[in-house]
Interface confidence: medium
Amino acid sequence: QPDAINAPVTCCYNFTNRKISVQRLASYRRITSSKCPKEAVIFKTIVAKEICADPKQKWVQDSMDHLDKQTQTPKT
Protein backbone atom coordinates (compact mmCIF):
# COMPACT_ATOMS: atom_id res chain seq x y z
CA GLN A 1 0.00 0.00 0.00
CA PRO A 2 1.18 3.58 -0.64
CA ASP A 3 2.40 5.44 2.39
CA ALA A 4 2.03 9.21 2.93
CA ILE A 5 4.91 10.11 5.22
CA ASN A 6 4.56 13.85 5.13
CA ALA A 7 1.42 14.77 3.26
CA PRO A 8 1.01 15.58 0.44
CA VAL A 9 3.93 13.36 -0.73
CA THR A 10 2.88 9.73 -1.15
CA CYS A 11 5.60 7.13 -1.67
CA CYS A 12 5.71 3.43 -2.49
CA TYR A 13 8.19 1.20 -0.67
CA ASN A 14 7.03 -2.15 -2.02
CA PHE A 15 5.41 -3.20 -5.25
CA THR A 16 2.61 -5.71 -5.71
CA ASN A 17 3.90 -9.19 -6.54
CA ARG A 18 0.98 -10.09 -8.76
CA LYS A 19 -0.71 -8.81 -11.88
CA ILE A 20 -4.08 -7.23 -11.20
CA SER A 21 -6.87 -7.75 -13.69
CA VAL A 22 -7.03 -4.64 -15.83
CA GLN A 23 -10.81 -4.71 -15.56
CA ARG A 24 -10.54 -4.04 -11.83
CA LEU A 25 -8.49 -0.88 -12.28
CA ALA A 26 -10.21 2.49 -12.18
CA SER A 27 -7.36 4.98 -12.44
CA TYR A 28 -3.67 5.49 -11.80
CA ARG A 29 -1.17 8.13 -10.87
CA ARG A 30 2.60 8.23 -11.30
CA ILE A 31 4.91 8.82 -8.34
CA THR A 32 8.05 10.64 -9.48
CA SER A 33 8.89 12.76 -6.44
CA SER A 34 12.58 12.94 -5.50
CA LYS A 35 11.42 12.59 -1.90
CA CYS A 36 10.45 8.97 -2.64
CA PRO A 37 12.91 6.07 -2.79
CA LYS A 38 11.64 4.79 -6.14
CA GLU A 39 9.45 5.73 -9.04
CA ALA A 40 6.09 4.03 -8.87
CA VAL A 41 2.58 3.82 -10.21
CA ILE A 42 -0.36 3.80 -7.82
CA PHE A 43 -3.44 2.11 -9.22
CA LYS A 44 -6.85 2.72 -7.71
CA THR A 45 -9.24 -0.22 -8.09
CA ILE A 46 -12.98 -0.15 -8.65
CA VAL A 47 -13.45 -0.80 -4.93
CA ALA A 48 -11.13 2.13 -4.10
CA LYS A 49 -8.10 0.11 -2.99
CA GLU A 50 -4.73 1.70 -3.80
CA ILE A 51 -1.91 -0.50 -5.05
CA CYS A 52 1.75 0.28 -5.66
CA ALA A 53 3.15 -1.15 -8.88
CA ASP A 54 6.46 -1.12 -10.71
CA PRO A 55 6.29 1.12 -13.82
CA LYS A 56 9.02 -0.99 -15.46
CA GLN A 57 6.75 -4.05 -15.62
CA LYS A 58 4.94 -4.65 -18.90
CA TRP A 59 1.56 -5.38 -17.31
CA VAL A 60 1.73 -2.03 -15.50
CA GLN A 61 2.48 -0.21 -18.76
CA ASP A 62 -0.31 -2.13 -20.55
CA SER A 63 -2.73 -1.25 -17.76
CA MET A 64 -1.85 2.44 -17.93
CA ASP A 65 -2.32 2.38 -21.72
CA HIS A 66 -5.70 0.68 -21.28
CA LEU A 67 -6.84 3.25 -18.72
CA ASP A 68 -5.60 6.11 -20.90
CA LYS A 69 -7.62 4.78 -23.85
CA GLN A 70 -10.66 4.31 -21.62
CA THR A 71 -10.41 7.93 -20.49
CA GLN A 72 -10.12 9.17 -24.09
CA THR A 73 -13.20 7.20 -25.22
CA PRO A 74 -16.32 9.33 -24.78
CA LYS A 75 -19.09 7.52 -22.92
CA THR A 76 -22.22 6.95 -25.00
Epitope: R18, K19, I20, S21, Q23, A26, V47, K49, I51, W59
Partner: antibody
Framework: QVQLVQSGAEVKKPGASVKVSCKVS????????MHWVRQAPGKGLEWMGG????????IYAQKFQGRVTMTEDTSTDTAYMELSSLRSEDTAVYFC????????????WDQGTLVTVSS | DIVMTQSPDSLAASLGERATINCKSS????????????LVWYQQKPGQPPKLLIY???IRESGVPDRFSGSGSGTDFTLTISSLQAEDVAVYFC?????????FGQGTKVEIK
Protein backbone atom coordinates in the same frame (compact mmCIF):
# COMPACT_ATOMS: atom_id res chain seq x y z
CA GLN B 1 -4.68 -20.69 -23.11
CA VAL B 2 -4.72 -21.56 -19.40
CA GLN B 3 -5.08 -25.22 -18.50
CA LEU B 4 -5.69 -26.59 -15.01
CA VAL B 5 -5.24 -30.18 -13.85
CA GLN B 6 -6.31 -31.26 -10.37
CA SER B 7 -5.31 -34.23 -8.25
CA GLY B 8 -7.51 -37.34 -8.00
CA ALA B 9 -10.48 -38.22 -5.82
CA GLU B 10 -9.95 -38.69 -2.08
CA VAL B 11 -11.79 -40.57 0.66
CA LYS B 12 -11.19 -39.28 4.18
CA LYS B 13 -12.36 -40.02 7.70
CA PRO B 14 -14.09 -37.33 9.79
CA GLY B 15 -11.53 -35.20 11.59
CA ALA B 16 -8.83 -35.79 8.98
CA SER B 17 -7.37 -33.27 6.51
CA VAL B 18 -7.27 -33.30 2.72
CA LYS B 19 -4.90 -31.51 0.38
CA VAL B 20 -5.98 -31.00 -3.24
CA SER B 21 -3.56 -29.76 -5.90
CA CYS B 22 -4.14 -27.80 -9.09
CA LYS B 23 -1.38 -27.62 -11.70
CA VAL B 24 -1.34 -24.68 -14.11
CA SER B 25 0.01 -24.78 -17.66
CA UNK B 26 -0.03 -22.22 -20.45
CA UNK B 27 0.65 -19.42 -17.98
CA UNK B 28 2.68 -19.10 -14.81
CA UNK B 29 0.84 -19.09 -11.50
CA UNK B 30 2.03 -15.54 -10.79
CA UNK B 31 0.17 -14.29 -13.88
CA UNK B 32 -3.12 -15.58 -12.50
CA UNK B 33 -5.31 -15.44 -9.44
CA MET B 34 -6.19 -18.94 -8.29
CA HIS B 35 -9.46 -19.56 -6.45
CA TRP B 36 -11.19 -22.59 -4.99
CA VAL B 37 -14.92 -23.28 -5.27
CA ARG B 38 -16.74 -26.30 -3.92
CA GLN B 39 -20.02 -28.00 -4.71
CA ALA B 40 -21.73 -30.49 -2.42
CA PRO B 41 -23.77 -33.22 -4.18
CA GLY B 42 -26.88 -31.68 -5.75
CA LYS B 43 -26.07 -28.25 -4.29
CA GLY B 44 -24.84 -24.87 -5.54
CA LEU B 45 -21.38 -23.36 -5.97
CA GLU B 46 -19.59 -22.04 -2.91
CA TRP B 47 -16.50 -19.82 -3.14
CA MET B 48 -13.95 -20.88 -0.53
CA GLY B 49 -11.15 -18.42 -1.11
CA GLY B 50 -8.34 -17.43 -3.39
CA UNK B 51 -5.50 -15.08 -4.09
CA UNK B 52 -6.60 -11.45 -4.15
CA UNK B 53 -3.95 -9.34 -5.90
CA UNK B 54 -5.64 -6.18 -4.67
CA UNK B 55 -4.68 -7.14 -1.13
CA UNK B 56 -1.59 -9.09 -2.28
CA UNK B 57 -2.71 -12.01 -0.15
CA UNK B 58 -4.93 -15.06 -0.05
CA ILE B 59 -8.39 -14.34 1.27
CA TYR B 60 -10.85 -16.90 2.61
CA ALA B 61 -14.62 -17.06 2.88
CA GLN B 62 -15.60 -16.47 6.49
CA LYS B 63 -17.23 -19.90 6.67
CA PHE B 64 -13.87 -21.62 6.13
CA GLN B 65 -11.59 -19.29 8.10
CA GLY B 66 -9.22 -21.27 10.32
CA ARG B 67 -9.98 -24.56 8.59
CA VAL B 68 -8.69 -23.95 5.09
CA THR B 69 -5.21 -23.09 3.85
CA MET B 70 -4.43 -22.19 0.26
CA THR B 71 -0.82 -22.20 -0.84
CA GLU B 72 1.16 -21.94 -4.05
CA ASP B 73 4.39 -23.45 -5.28
CA THR B 74 5.53 -21.05 -7.99
CA SER B 75 8.46 -23.30 -8.93
CA THR B 76 6.01 -25.94 -10.20
CA ASP B 77 3.06 -23.63 -10.94
CA THR B 78 0.89 -25.67 -8.60
CA ALA B 79 -1.75 -24.37 -6.21
CA TYR B 80 -2.90 -26.32 -3.15
CA MET B 81 -6.02 -26.23 -1.01
CA GLU B 82 -5.91 -27.97 2.37
CA LEU B 83 -9.08 -28.40 4.41
CA SER B 84 -8.79 -29.70 7.96
CA SER B 85 -11.16 -31.11 10.60
CA LEU B 86 -13.23 -32.72 7.88
CA ARG B 87 -16.87 -33.57 8.51
CA SER B 88 -19.47 -35.34 6.39
CA GLU B 89 -20.83 -31.99 5.12
CA ASP B 90 -17.45 -31.38 3.46
CA THR B 91 -18.20 -34.16 0.97
CA ALA B 92 -18.12 -32.22 -2.30
CA VAL B 93 -16.40 -31.65 -5.59
CA TYR B 94 -13.63 -29.09 -5.13
CA PHE B 95 -12.81 -26.95 -8.18
CA CYS B 96 -9.84 -24.72 -8.82
CA UNK B 97 -10.76 -21.76 -11.01
CA UNK B 98 -8.75 -18.87 -12.34
CA UNK B 99 -8.83 -15.75 -14.44
CA UNK B 100 -6.26 -14.21 -16.72
CA UNK B 101 -4.93 -10.66 -16.73
CA UNK B 102 -7.66 -9.20 -18.94
CA UNK B 103 -10.65 -10.69 -17.14
CA UNK B 104 -11.87 -10.36 -13.60
CA UNK B 105 -14.14 -13.39 -13.73
CA UNK B 106 -13.42 -17.13 -13.58
CA UNK B 107 -12.95 -18.13 -17.20
CA UNK B 108 -11.05 -21.35 -16.62
CA TRP B 109 -12.11 -24.26 -14.40
CA ASP B 110 -10.77 -27.76 -13.94
CA GLN B 111 -13.00 -30.84 -13.83
CA GLY B 112 -12.83 -30.86 -10.04
CA THR B 113 -11.75 -33.29 -7.32
CA LEU B 114 -14.32 -35.33 -5.43
CA VAL B 115 -13.59 -35.49 -1.70
CA THR B 116 -15.72 -37.96 0.23
CA VAL B 117 -15.78 -37.77 4.02
CA SER B 118 -17.08 -40.97 5.55
CA SER B 119 -16.40 -43.07 8.61
CA ASP C 1 -21.02 -9.51 1.41
CA ILE C 2 -23.08 -9.19 -1.75
CA VAL C 3 -25.91 -11.74 -1.70
CA MET C 4 -27.04 -13.12 -5.06
CA THR C 5 -30.62 -14.46 -5.31
CA GLN C 6 -31.88 -16.34 -8.34
CA SER C 7 -35.45 -17.07 -9.36
CA PRO C 8 -37.01 -19.43 -10.03
CA ASP C 9 -35.18 -22.35 -8.40
CA SER C 10 -36.27 -24.53 -11.31
CA LEU C 11 -38.21 -24.15 -14.53
CA ALA C 12 -39.59 -26.46 -17.20
CA ALA C 13 -40.27 -25.24 -20.71
CA SER C 14 -41.10 -26.91 -24.01
CA LEU C 15 -38.54 -27.27 -26.77
CA GLY C 16 -38.34 -24.04 -28.77
CA GLU C 17 -39.93 -22.05 -25.94
CA ARG C 18 -38.38 -19.06 -24.23
CA ALA C 19 -36.81 -19.56 -20.78
CA THR C 20 -35.99 -16.67 -18.45
CA ILE C 21 -33.88 -16.74 -15.28
CA ASN C 22 -33.57 -13.78 -12.92
CA CYS C 23 -30.70 -12.83 -10.64
CA LYS C 24 -30.82 -10.09 -8.03
CA SER C 25 -27.82 -8.73 -6.12
CA SER C 26 -28.15 -7.21 -2.65
CA UNK C 27 -26.10 -4.22 -3.80
CA UNK C 28 -25.16 -2.77 -7.15
CA UNK C 29 -22.43 -4.53 -9.16
CA UNK C 30 -22.27 -1.67 -11.67
CA UNK C 31 -19.10 0.43 -11.75
CA UNK C 32 -20.38 3.70 -13.16
CA UNK C 33 -17.05 5.04 -14.46
CA UNK C 34 -16.73 2.26 -17.04
CA UNK C 35 -20.45 1.42 -17.13
CA UNK C 36 -19.70 -2.26 -16.59
CA UNK C 37 -21.70 -4.72 -14.52
CA UNK C 38 -19.41 -7.21 -12.80
CA LEU C 39 -21.72 -10.17 -13.27
CA VAL C 40 -21.36 -13.48 -15.10
CA TRP C 41 -23.64 -16.39 -15.95
CA TYR C 42 -22.48 -20.01 -15.94
CA GLN C 43 -24.07 -23.17 -17.29
CA GLN C 44 -23.34 -26.44 -15.49
CA LYS C 45 -24.20 -29.90 -16.72
CA PRO C 46 -24.00 -32.99 -14.46
CA GLY C 47 -20.43 -34.15 -13.81
CA GLN C 48 -18.92 -31.07 -15.45
CA PRO C 49 -17.43 -27.82 -14.17
CA PRO C 50 -19.35 -24.59 -14.73
CA LYS C 51 -19.03 -23.19 -18.25
CA LEU C 52 -18.86 -19.44 -18.75
CA LEU C 53 -21.78 -18.21 -20.88
CA ILE C 54 -22.03 -14.45 -20.34
CA TYR C 55 -19.69 -11.87 -18.82
CA UNK C 56 -20.15 -8.14 -18.07
CA UNK C 57 -23.84 -9.15 -17.66
CA UNK C 58 -24.50 -9.13 -21.41
CA ILE C 59 -21.43 -10.21 -23.43
CA ARG C 60 -21.61 -13.74 -24.81
CA GLU C 61 -18.47 -15.83 -24.38
CA SER C 62 -17.00 -16.92 -27.69
CA GLY C 63 -18.68 -20.09 -29.01
CA VAL C 64 -21.87 -19.63 -26.98
CA PRO C 65 -25.01 -19.89 -29.18
CA ASP C 66 -26.83 -16.61 -29.77
CA ARG C 67 -30.06 -17.99 -28.27
CA PHE C 68 -28.41 -17.14 -24.91
CA SER C 69 -28.56 -13.49 -23.94
CA GLY C 70 -27.93 -11.54 -20.77
CA SER C 71 -29.45 -8.22 -19.75
CA GLY C 72 -29.91 -5.96 -16.76
CA SER C 73 -27.88 -3.48 -14.78
CA GLY C 74 -27.15 -2.48 -11.20
CA THR C 75 -28.91 -5.09 -9.09
CA ASP C 76 -31.33 -6.86 -11.47
CA PHE C 77 -30.21 -9.23 -14.19
CA THR C 78 -31.77 -11.73 -16.57
CA LEU C 79 -30.50 -14.69 -18.56
CA THR C 80 -32.76 -15.55 -21.49
CA ILE C 81 -32.71 -18.66 -23.64
CA SER C 82 -34.78 -17.55 -26.63
CA SER C 83 -35.54 -21.02 -28.00
CA LEU C 84 -34.88 -23.85 -25.57
CA GLN C 85 -32.94 -26.83 -26.97
CA ALA C 86 -32.46 -30.30 -25.45
CA GLU C 87 -28.76 -29.57 -24.85
CA ASP C 88 -29.67 -26.54 -22.69
CA VAL C 89 -30.88 -28.79 -19.86
CA ALA C 90 -28.53 -27.77 -17.04
CA VAL C 91 -28.22 -25.67 -13.90
CA TYR C 92 -27.50 -21.97 -14.43
CA PHE C 93 -25.68 -19.77 -11.92
CA CYS C 94 -25.06 -16.05 -11.73
CA UNK C 95 -21.97 -14.74 -9.93
CA UNK C 96 -20.76 -11.27 -9.02
CA UNK C 97 -17.09 -10.32 -9.27
CA UNK C 98 -17.46 -6.70 -8.19
CA UNK C 99 -16.14 -7.17 -4.67
CA UNK C 100 -14.79 -10.03 -2.60
CA UNK C 101 -15.98 -12.41 -1.35
CA UNK C 102 -17.10 -13.50 -4.81
CA UNK C 103 -20.64 -14.84 -4.47
CA PHE C 104 -22.92 -17.07 -6.54
CA GLY C 105 -26.66 -17.34 -6.89
CA GLN C 106 -28.13 -20.61 -5.62
CA GLY C 107 -28.72 -21.89 -9.17
CA THR C 108 -31.71 -22.46 -11.44
CA LYS C 109 -32.40 -25.90 -12.87
CA VAL C 110 -33.73 -25.84 -16.43
CA GLU C 111 -35.63 -28.87 -17.73
CA ILE C 112 -37.69 -29.80 -20.77
CA LYS C 113 -41.46 -29.98 -20.24
Amino acid sequence: QVQLVQSGAEVKKPGASVKVSCKVSGYTLTELSMHWVRQAPGKGLEWMGGFDPEDDETIYAQKFQGRVTMTEDTSTDTAYMELSSLRSEDTAVYFCATNDFWSGYFDCWDQGTLVTVSS
Amino acid sequence: DIVMTQSPDSLAASLGERATINCKSSQSVLYRSNNKNYLVWYQQKPGQPPKLLIYWASIRESGVPDRFSGSGSGTDFTLTISSLQAEDVAVYFCQQYYSSPWTFGQGTKVEIK
